[in-house]
Amino acid sequence: FGDEEERRCDPIRISMCQNLGYNVTKMPNLVGHELQTDAELQLTTFTPLIQYGCSSQLQFFLCSVYVPMCTEKINIPIGPCGGMCLSVKRRCEPVLKEFGFAWPESLNCSKFPPQNDHNHMCMEGPGDEEVPLPHKTPIQPGEE
């Protein structure tokens, strides 16, 4: 391979998406960003939900959308499966609604493959322990 050949995968530079089981991505991401700095700007708005802990899969799910997994073997980035999206949405949408906000259209679960197969590769994500949602009023997540 010559130096002039474009690298297929790039290191993930967004710290909240490091150490999640894969470490390279390829832009554009699944919402159309070409630069990781643009992805980062939007990702930071989800920190309250991540810290609140509405879903143990939320961070992995968001990262799989904003910095999807890349592998040298496959030309297309690998994002989340629809099942993981639905699981996260089911647990986190009520928290967003408490704030007075809707589930983001950019995270519409119908955009993602229902399950991982040879035709539509996607990440199932880590298992989401089925514990009850916190009973604490989620108006100000992270408040002590």
């Epitope: 967004i14 710290s15 909240m16 919402v31 159309g32 960003h33 630069l35 700095t37 643009d38 980062e40 700007l41 939007q42 930071t44 708005t45 989800f46 920190t47 309250p48 939900l49 810290q51 609140y52 967003l96 704030f99 906000f101 809707a102 983001p104 259209e105 950019s106 100000q140 997540p141 992270g142 408040e143 002590e144």
Partner: antibody, heavy 119, light 107 residues
Framework: EVQLVESGGGLVQPGGSLRLSCAAS????????MHWVRQAPGKGLEWVAY????????YYADSVKGRFTISADTSKNTAYLQMNSLRAEDTAVYYC????????????WGQGTLVTVSS | DIQMTQSPSSLSASVGDRVTITCRAS??????VAWYQQKPGKAPKLLIY???SLYSGVPSRFSGSRSGTDFTLTISSLQPEDFATYYC?????????FGQGTKVEIK
Amino acid sequence: EVQLVESGGGLVQPGGSLRLSCAASGFNLSSYSMHWVRQAPGKGLEWVAYISSYYGYTYYADSVKGRFTISADTSKNTAYLQMNSLRAEDTAVYYCARPAPGHWGFDYWGQGTLVTVSS
Amino acid sequence: DIQMTQSPSSLSASVGDRVTITCRASQSVSSAVAWYQQKPGKAPKLLIYSASSLYSGVPSRFSGSRSGTDFTLTISSLQPEDFATYYCQQWYYAPITFGQGTKVEIK
């Protein structure tokens, strides 16, 4: 109740420095990115900088890069904007603003603090 | 940087009028657009997020829509308290950028 209160504005000579503070209450600063937006007299809104203290991200508008530094002290629940090498064109009301969770708009703003750069 | 070109820069209208303000992004910003209302000496207030979602507590006479890179804020029936300056904002690309504002004045 969520509140953002800015302070530290005032009159400063060109080339001088000023530090603005944004005291947050009603939520934990570590859970949110915080932004500074400014508005020159009679003009529109200009985004200045943001910090995500939880992840350590900062980002600046080109117009202030290298002169302004954004920081946060989560123990005091306060964000700061250190402004150095101030210019006449930095004269503005400076607002701190909190982004809506999981969305792309500012749902809470401070009342603003006026910075005047003049000799 | 992404340019958000807002028009008109000012308009005169009467109570009860339907008012439309437009913002055009210099390239696609998806639906990551918000609209704000600002009155003299006050901080801006969020009206619309994600191009078309009404923020909690905002009267239903305000609405937002998107067509490609064109974004529209509509006030269906202008009320006396709506005379103010309105700004659009994109949050798709860094840096965040605002439109130059539209001042809605009493005719």
